[in-house]
Amino acid sequence: QPPPPPPDATCHQVRSFFQRLQPGLKWVPETPVPGSDLQVCLPKGPTCCSRKMEEKYQLTARLNMEQLLQSASMELKFLIIQNAAVFQEAFEIVVRHAKNYTNAMFKNNYPSLTPQAFEFVGEFFTDVSLYILGSDINVDDMVNELFDSLFPVIYTQLMNPGLPDSALDINECLRGARRDLKVFGNFPKLIMTQVSKSLQVTRIFLQALNLGIEVINTTDHLKFSKDCGRMLTRMWYCSYCQGLMMVKPCGGYCNVVMQGCMAGVVEIDKYWREYILSLEELVNGMYRIYDMENVLLGLFSTIHDSIQYVQKNAGKLTTTIGKLCAHSQQRQYRSAYYPEDLFIDKKVLKVAHVEHEETLSSRRRELIQKLKSFISFYSALPGYICSHSPVAENDTLCWNGQELVERYSQKAARNGMKNQFNLHELKMKGPEPVVSQIIDKLKHINQLLRTMSMPKGRVLDKNLDEEGFESGDCGDDEDECIGGSGDGMIKVKNQLRFLAELAYDLDVDDAPGNSQQATPKDNEISTFHNLGNVHSPLK
């Protein structure tokens, strides 16, 4: 092995380099010293480093490492942050459109029910938004509340408009009768099923994206241990003490050091891979009744159908409710009277199937494809960081932590390090508490994602089919089946494309299908066009 080059007799180069790190030269010896007080850059001869310099190098090494880690994750972080924000905004827009569609349906078909219907619809969709954003609200309660509120208004305004004002105290009786008599048939249950399934999936999708951000933020801001700081210092700076300013660390040596420093972080890898694959599975199942865009934008039609169902049964209902609520002031508001079965419309309820082009669905899949390119992010981190910091190619004429070598030998390097610092010990310490916490959160979300992954076969649940509804598929080439009944309905070939291209922002006055065009809200439209088109500033 070649002898080390002669050290700088005046430590001049070391002084000028160190001054860039730490203004002032009081810590730098003018000429090489024995360095017996050094703890990291243990000298084999005279050295241009002091204990204070060594401490500064350690601090700088740890900061460098943190910056390298942050730049390594910047593209991934940007991808998830932007998509989480874009999807959340897009879901809010879908909810707003769904509300406007429903209000427009009431205005066009049942003007006598407004403005009360608008109030109930508004409250329902507020609950939907709160649920998506993580509120602990029960979907069945939300749907029940919508129908509980609507029925007294439907009864007093549509079915029995001649009721005197004094009879309005029957509202409470009607509210109870709504459930007891199943006045809307199975429509409330159908809506509960569709809304709960689609919103659950939407909510967990957003939760998963937000956890992804939290994972990156956690590993992004890791504070590296003093042991790691010593290893990094030895790799990046100890050569300077010998006046070897231009020498680069050996690549193999860098990998060993990085694997030691990042042993805890790399433990995330298994759960990160599972996270991306589970998220992909979830996204693959987000269609039909598991797609909130599809379900919510079709709700106006199902609610319309449910009101038509009430109207079809108006004769029997009016008679029954006349008996039930005649003495509403005297009776306790709980019905014990169950009439003979009302007319049940065994209508084929077809659940809409949205073409995937230009919809939120295609954007979700695009995001997954981009995320999958980061599936090995954590296992590849040590290598990535070494490839983005100065290392000698081919491990020739490089620094191995103690001296300049012609060729790097991992065994020799490890033997040389034993008396200074035990790499194996660092690995055995296990992950930082914050890393352990984030691993626990990943385990939890992965379990949720697995639980939520959809059965692919049938559109409607079996129990719904058994209760008087038949599930029917819309052919892929057909127009949507979602708004097939009633005046003023629309057939939606492709919902978000419809929203984007026609630039509708429906107000109450703009019924679905009405000819007048509202002023487009540019920010909403651009949201759909730009959804998921994430271009990292690094690319």
Partner: antibody, heavy 121, light 110 residues
Framework: QVQLQESGGGLVQPGRSLRLSCAAS????????MTWVRQAPGKGLEWVSS????????YYADSVKGRFTISRDNSKNTLYLQMNSLRAEDTAVYYC??????????????WGQGTLVTVSS | QSALTQPPSASGSPGQSVTISCTGT?????????VSWYQQYPGKAPKLLIY???NRPSGVPDRFSGSKSGTSASLAITGLQAEDGADYYC??????????FGGGTKVTVL
């Protein structure tokens, strides 16, 4: 007419338990969310706990979480508040309130007259 | 959860107007959430005046009106009457659906 009547209040020692009840009449109890609100002497209103119409969802103020439990029996039109590990700062008039809606606490359109709970040794 | 912020007192002569403010955060008043207002006389239970930011239950005079903008809400009483002297509380809920009240405003009719 619509009415809420609280009962079960009284004097209790710190660390002990008490169960408040609220009997509802004049409305379809099972379709509305219900809430307990308290008011310490000379102080403002403080929300304690809420429960959705089905009883599936319950919500608690941080100050009572883990000590108080809200529940309802829709067949009896009754709301309950089980108060354990009572403290001096729990002394207040406890109001039972009906929500306008069923899904969660939003606005309280009917209130009981309140029952006084005094926690003192 | 911290209380919404209300001024402790407000006053006006009969026939005048009084406005009470209620300030919250983006997670309660400023979110999707609705604001309600209550009137309370000493020793009595509160009474709902406004729900859903600006809606009046039947029986509440139209002298009372509510509004919401951003993270603030306000209750306006026009044509102040002697019986309007009472405590007024705003109320909303946060993103966890936990209810939050304001500290209360004592309105004095001079």
């Amino acid at each position: 007419q619509v009415q809420l009547q609280e009962s079960g209040g009284g004097l209790v020692q710190p660390g002990r338990s008490l169960r408040l009840s609220c009997a509802a009449s004049g409305f379809t109890f099972s379709t509305y969310a219900m809430t307990w609100v308290r008011q310490a002497p000379g102080k403002g209103l403080e929300w304690v706990s809420s429960i959705s119409s089905s009883g599936e969802s319950t919500y608690y103020a941080d100050s009572v979480k883990g000590r108080f439990t809200i529940s309802r029996d829709n067949s009896k039109n009754t709301l309950y508040l089980q108060m354990n590990s009572l403290r001096a700062e729990d002394t207040a008039v406890y109001y039972c309130a009906k929500d306008r809606r069923g899904s969660h606490a939003d606005a309280f359109d009917v209130w009981g007259q309140g029952t006084l709970v005094t926690v003192s040794s | 959860q911290s209380a919404l912020t209300q001024p402790p007192s407000a006053s006006g002569s009969p026939g005048q107007s009084v406005t009470i403010s209620c300030t919250g955060t983006s997670s309660d008043v400023g979110g999707y959430n609705y604001v309600s207002w209550y009137q309370q006389y000493p020793g009595k239970a509160p009474k709902l005046l406004i729900y859903g930011n600006s809606n009046r239950p039947s029986g509440v005079p139209d002298r009372f009106s509510g509004s919401k903008s951003g993270t603030s809400a306000s209750l306006a009483i026009t044509g102040l009457q002697a019986e309007d002297g009472a405590d007024y509380y705003c109320q909303s809920y946060d993103s966890s659906l936990r209810v939050v009240f304001g500290g209360g405003t004592k309105v004095t009719v001079l």
